[in-house]
């Protein structure tokens, strides 16, 4: 009879066991265990009759179609097997052990005891055939077996061979190298890459197989298992396999597909092919005169693309317009897609016009082209170069006048200060009270008018200033201040302000330029009080041109000392000498009480010291700060006056050979102008210059040249 | 013709503060300084400040400083007193007048618990 | 500040008559730039607020009658009504404008 066990393990003896077992008897134990585990047999005891080739009593152990053992006998000789200590393991998930006994046993046999267990099968291991074990990795596990993949790879629908994914590749560029997936190593299996080409309609894409080629076939049937196929408009190429590449394709067309099939067997390398786009030929290029075509090839085809440019100081010009290259490309027909521009010298142009300067040409017939040469000249004696710049501007490659120091700018002519057009007289006799200026003779002194419109009724006063640049005016900060509240300092409104220039005669100021202000600025410390710090700008409203009859003073150097004692200065002014005067009589044009011609005066520097002790003598409040020096007379006679205020009190600098603002007339008295031992106070402008500065919006070093030549 | 047109009268208590206004006309607003004098019931003339409206520029009387404001709007021409902390002695009419010549018409100021 | 005190405090001139009012400042009013003396002349009546009468403390503003002259310089200054109408009825003030304005403390004019 047939027993049928399913268990993963079990015990099997023979008929009657321990006792002996019957004659004539047979058993079957069919033991089926799940799939992935096969079935180890061992036994405990054995003890069946002996007979050669077991042709007695035996235990007969097989699977479906194959004996794995037979056994009979106590122990093992020549011709019959026992168990002992062997183990039989079936191949499979089934084992079938069969116990037989024939008619007659001569002595007591007591049979067998018999164990079975399912144990794993180790599939990683044991899987031989290729068409069943994992193409990548296995991993086993107890009953069973699963197959993953490399990166980059998926595991087919088999789940066994690893495939790439390798449907969506896109090739624009002009040139490209294309390759079975891992190349040179064994292309995956079960795949099924698409390789698309596709590039810009005028080119046309030629294959090349390099290298190695090697893709699965057969003796007799053309590429059954792998095979690549090329797809150009509706005609397809190929299918190609084996290890002879096909010969180069030139495909006619701007878009192919290239179709590579793998079956799910095979160890082959692959394949590697490179392509080129070809597009039609365009005529050959001369470059333009004076330039040059890059790249320079003996070939160019479609859309190849060529720059021109010119030598140095040459620019390429393309319907009139000017540009430094030119682009132009082979079209798909064959054509450029425009004319070899040509190439023109670069021109300068008219140079920029220098304010206050002259332009002369040192190339013949005015040329302003490349390497043409200029020089600028500053429109003598009123304006002198800044820098000393040589004013030589070369015409570069860029079509812009350079010159070495100052590049593109301009250069700037600044007005020469401290030179009258007529030399001042010489200071060897003193001059008692003061005498009539020849024209020129004074050409930075300003008259300054105010009519303050802001109170009722009108306020009108004048004083002096002295022209700095054509720009800039210097004078005191009590003539630019509100007349009506003695304790404020309120500066008038530049409205209210009229300058005027080049005036010899106050009756004839039709020679004069005359200025609007553009901005009032007073010292931020000047005091009422003391007029400490008397000192402020006006800037003009336009700039003024500079002739023999107006030009400016030189500042003097920072020099807290000031100017030295007993040097003897000039002072100019229209000041009055009747105390009687009224504004209204200053202004209007017909009257001879005050000085209608300008006047100056010769004055020293009055010691400070002697100066201090002569205010700090009188009754009053009367204080000489550092920031102010005397000037004047023991014996009195000639002084500075009403009206003189904000004029420049100017000394001769012998090392700049010019004349410098050393002073302004500020204060003096209280007794009558030109009264004895009532020395003059000016504001010492030396302690002023890096505010003078700032305020004109100019750094020190641009001017202080111009004095210490 | 030059007008000064002055807001109403002000009644206010100790502490309190009152801005009067002074509307001109007839000229450029800007350009003249405005000034500020007060009399109180009986007495003479003190002054107070002034305002030049085109610049902002003020100048106060030492005894007012801290307690008036001045302020102009050149958009309506009109100039604006503030006197703030009032006590009783700040009973007074309140003038404006045009630098020296034109006058308002005075604005009364009680100041009263 | 600078004081100004007016003299007399009230005065009483027939119709017709010449009437002196005088106004003496703490410090000088000329400023030697303008030659101008900063003082002025006002004329206060009852309910109404002052009118310029003088400037500069001669000049006669616009529209004010010619019996109204002014006169001094530096610290003393002078107004005279040279022939008294009862419409000149009112207070005077002298005012400086040299300095932060100060006003003098006014003088009463009235018919005798």
């Known amino acids: 009879h047939t027993v049928e066990l399913n268990n993963m393990f079990g015990q099997i003896q023979s008929p009657g066991y321990p006792d002996s077992y019957p004659s004539d008897s047979e058993v079957t134990w069919n033991i089926t265990v799940p799939d992935g585990f096969r079935i180890k047999l061992y036994f405990m005891h054995f003890n069946l009759e002996s007979s050669y080739l077991c042709e007695y009593d035996y235990v007969k152990v097989e699977t479906e179609d194959q004996v794995l053992a037979t056994f009979c006998g106590r122990e093992t000789t020549d011709t019959e097997q026992t168990p002992g200590q062997e183990v039989v393991l079936s191949p499979g998930s089934f084992m079938s052990i069969t116990f037989r006994s024939d008619f007659s046993n001569e002595e007591r046999f007591t049979g067998f005891d018999a164990h079975y267990m399912a144990v794993d099968v180790d599939e990683c291991k044991e899987r031989e055939d290729e068409e069943l074990s994992c193409d990548h990795y296995c991993h086993n596990y107890i009953g069973g077996y699963y197959c993953s993949c490399r990166f980059g790879y998926i595991l087919h629908t088999d789940n066994r061979t690893c495939r790439v994914e390798c449907s969506d590749n896109l090739f624009t560029q002009r040139t490209g190298v294309i390759t079975s997936p891992d190349f040179p190593n064994p292309y995956p299996k079960s795949s099924e890459c698409l390789y698309t080409i596709e590039l810009e309609e005028g080119f046309m894409v030629n294959l090349q197989f390099e290298d190695i080629f090697d893709i699965e076939d057969h003796p007799e049937v053309p590429c059954p298992y792998d095979y690549i196929k090329i797809k150009v408009g509706p005609k397809v190429l190929g299918p190609f396999c084996g290890e002879k590449a096909p010969e180069p394709i030139s495909t006619q067309s701007h878009s192919v597909l290239i179709l590579f099939h793998s079956d799910n067997s095979g160890e082959n390398r692959g394949w590697r092919l490179s392509y080129r786009a070809a597009g039609n030929e365009c005529p050959e290029l001369q470059p333009p005169v004076h330039g040059k075509i890059e790249p320079s090839q003996a070939k160019y085809f479609f859309k190849d693309q060529v720059l021109v440019s010119c030598d140095t100081g040459y620019k390429v010009l393309k319907d009139n317009v000017e540009m430094d290259t030119f682009q132009i490309e082979c079209l798909k027909d064959g054509t450029w897609s425009n004319k070899i521009p040509t190439c023109k010298i670069v021109d300068c142009r008219a140079p920029g016009e220098l304010e206050h300067g002259l332009i002369t040409f040192s190339t013949r017939n005015n040329l302003t082209t490349y390497k043409s040469e200029i020089k600028y000249s500053c429109q003598e004696p009123y304006y002198k170069m800044l820098n000393n710049n040589t004013g030589i501007y070369t015409c570069s490659a860029q079509g812009v006048w350079m010159n070495k120091v100052l590049g593109r700018s301009l250069p700037t002519c600044l007005p020469e200060c401290g030179q009258p057009s007529r030399s001042l007289p010489s200071l060897v006799k003193r001059i008692i009270g003061g005498r009539n200026a020849e024209p020129g003779l004074f050409p930075w002194q300003a008259l300054i008018v105010v009519e303050d419109t802001s109170r009722v009724p009108n306020d009108k006063w004048f004083g002096s200033g002295a022209l700095l640049s054509a720009s800039w005016i210097l004078t005191a900060a009590h003539v630019l201040r509100s007349q009506r509240r003695d304790t404020t300092v309120i500066p008038v409104s530049k409205e209210h302000v009229t300058v005027y220039l080049g005036l010899h005669d106050v009756r004839d100021k039709s020679g004069a330029v005359n200025s609007s202000a553009a901005r009032v600025v007073l010292h931020p410390d000047f005091n009422i009080q003391n007029y400490n710090h008397d000192i402020a700008l006006v800037q003009l409203q336009e700039p003024v041109p500079l002739g023999p009859h107006v030009m400016p003073v030189c500042l003097p150097r920072l020099e807290p000392e000031g100017p030295a004692p007993h040097m003897l200065g000039l002072v100019a002014g229209w000041g009055i000498s009747n105390p009687n005067v009224t504004v209204d009589e200053i202004i209007s044009s017909g009257t001879r009480t005050l000085s209608d011609v300008l006047q100056y005066v010769k004055l020293p520097v009055v010691p400070h010291a002697e100066c201090k002790t002569s205010y700090e003598s009188r009754s009053g409040n009367y204080s000489v700060t550092e920031n102010m020096f005397c000037a004047g007379y023991y014996e009195g006679g000639k002084d500075t006056c009403l009206g003189d205020s904000g004029g420049a009190f100017v000394i001769f600098d012998d090392l700049s050979q010019r004349w410098v603002v050393q002073g302004l007339v500020s204060w003096g008295g209280p007794e009558e102008c030109g009264s004895k031992q009532v020395y003059g106070v000016y504001t010492k402008v030396s302690n002023y210059v890096d505010w003078v500065w700032e305020q004109m919006g100019l750094p020190q070093s641009v001017v202080e040249p111009q004095v210490e030549r | 013709q030059v007008q000064l047109v002055q807001s109403g009268a002000e009644v206010k208590k100790p502490g309190a503060s009152v801005k009067v206004s002074c509307k001109a006309s007839g000229y450029t607003f800007t350009g003249k300084w405005i000034e500020w004098v007060r009399q109180a019931p009986g007495q003479g003339l003190e002054w107070i400040g002034e305002i030049l409206p085109g610049t902002g520029s003020t100048n106060y009387n030492e005894k007012f400083k801290g307690r008036a404001t001045f302020t102009a709007d050149s958009s309506t021409s009109t100039a604006y007193m503030e006197l703030s902390s009032l006590r009783s002695e700040d009973t007074a009419v309140y003038y404006c007048?045009?630098?020296?010549?034109?006058w308002g018409q005075g604005t009364l100021v009680t100041v009263s618990s | 500040d600078i004081v100004m005190t007016q003299s007399p405090d009230s005065l009483a001139v027939s119709l017709g008559e010449r009437a002196t009012i005088n106004c003496k400042s703490s410090q000088s009013l000329l400023n030697t730039r303008t030659r101008k003396n900063y003082l002025a002349w006002y004329q206060q009546k009852p309910g109404q607020p002052p009118k310029l009468l003088i400037y500069?403390?001669?000049t006669r503003e616009s529209g004010v009658p010619d019996r109204f002259s002014g006169s001094g310089s530096g610290t003393d200054f002078t107004l005279t009504i040279s022939s008294l109408q009862a419409e000149d009825v009112a207070v005077y003030y002298c005012k400086q404008s040299y300095n932060i304005p100060t006003f003098g403390q006014g003088t009463k004019v009235e018919i005798k």
């Open positions: 007048l045009r630098s020296e010549d034109v």
């Open positions: 500069w403390a001669s």
